[in-house]
């Protein structure tokens, strides 16, 4: 039930995938991650105007109630719809190990 | 990977389940739903301070990057972690029918 992908606020202003470059220090990972030393973090950023990429019925309800009661009910929020896995080389007591994280990098976005 | 449930902002200020009473008119459903005439909409509302109910690794990253770049990266957002199904009696071309919606009422909440 994913609604319109046309952003009424102008190009790039609505909920979409962004890439933010971050070091291990930025992420607070320097003490337990060996590699990569820098991560291209993909995340969901942007506004969720009426019915834009509405994830489900709940998002549609939220839009309606936000319009009626903006001080009580927040607008839908731009969050990951799915994720891309990422591999980290981690420090361990005995050396290093490879670990795959399924919930680290956003793959695409919707409003909920 | 759901982190702390202690809200540092004070009781009830952080991400949690709220109930908002809404009529069919409020929801824009009056033309296609017969019953219920009023819905107790459960939704997720509240702030997501550092590591509060962090849904996953992505939420933890978002918290770290929001602290570093608050103008670029938004704080995690309070959204449903799961849903309760709800039944609507809908108007159809031939009369009425029962329809179960799995994604209408939030059951519990997390930050993402």
């Amino acid at each position: 039930a994913r609604n319109g992908d046309h952003c009424p606020l102008g190009p790039g202003r609505c909920c979409r995938l962004h890439t933010v470059r971050a070091s291990l220090e930025d992420l607070g990972w320097a003490d337990w991650v060996l590699s990569p030393r820098e991560v291209q973090v993909t995340m969901c950023i942007g506004a969720c105007p009426s019915q834009f990429r509405a994830a489900n019925m709940h998002a549609q309800i939220k839009t309606s109630l936000h319009r009626l009661k903006p001080d009580t009910v927040p607008a839908p929020c731009c969050v990951p719809a799915s994720y891309n896995p990422m591999v980290l080389i981690q420090k361990t007591d005995t050396g290093v190990s490879l670990q795959t994280y399924d919930d680290l990098l956003a793959k695409d976005c919707h409003c909920i | 990977a759901r982190n702390g449930d202690h809200c540092p902002l004070g009781p009830g200020r952080c991400c949690r389940l709220h109930t908002v009473r809404a009529s069919l008119e409020d929801l824009g459903w009056a033309d296609w739903v017969l019953s219920p005439r009023e819905v107790q909409v459960t939704m997720c509302i509240g702030a997501c301070p550092s590591q509060f109910r962090a849904a996953n690794m992505h939420a933890q990253i978002k918290t770290s990057l929001h602290r570093l770049k608050p103008d670029t990266v938004p704080a995690p957002c309070c959204v449903p972690a799961s849903y309760n199904p709800m039944v609507l009696i809908q108007k159809t071309d031939t009369g009425v029918s029962l329809q179960t919606y799995d994604d209408l009422l939030a059951k519990d909440c997390h930050c993402i």
Partner: nanobody
């Protein structure tokens, strides 16, 4: 405390019939909307039919319309679901639930009892 007990399930061949019963104890059924729900393995609950408390109106999901009939017997404090022309996709655990006083249907799918297993297979 509102307690509902379902019975009448079983194994039946495609095209066959069953009648499920939902018996109440601790309260009078005719004051409440009663709904039948089902849950197939690995799927969410689905409302199948309900009967309103106010005027006895009956409602059905599109998947069972014309095949299932809901009725109530106030003297026996029981609601029935007559299931005809059963199909393999009707296989599920069937539950009944009571809605709020004065409602047309139990709206929120909440907690329920043990249910009764219906299996349609040749």
């Amino acid at each position: 405390q509102l307690q509902l007990v379902e019975s009448g399930g079983g194994l039946v061949q495609p095209g066959g019939s069953l009648r499920l019963s939902c018996a109440a104890s601790g309260f009078t059924l005719d004051y409440y909307a009663i709904g039948w729900f089902r849950q197939a393995p690995g799927k969410g609950p689905e409302a199948v039919s309900c009967i309103s408390s106010s005027d006895g109106s009956t409602y059905y999901s599109d998947s069972v319309k014309g095949r299932f009939t809901i009725s109530r017997d106030n003297a026996k404090n029981t609601v029935y679901l007559q299931m005809n022309s059963l199909k393999p996709e009707d296989t599920a655990v069937y539950y009944c639930a009571a809605g709020e006083y004065g409602s047309d249907c139990p709206v929120q799918v909440g907690s329920w009892g043990q249910g009764t297993q219906v299996t349609v297979s040749s």
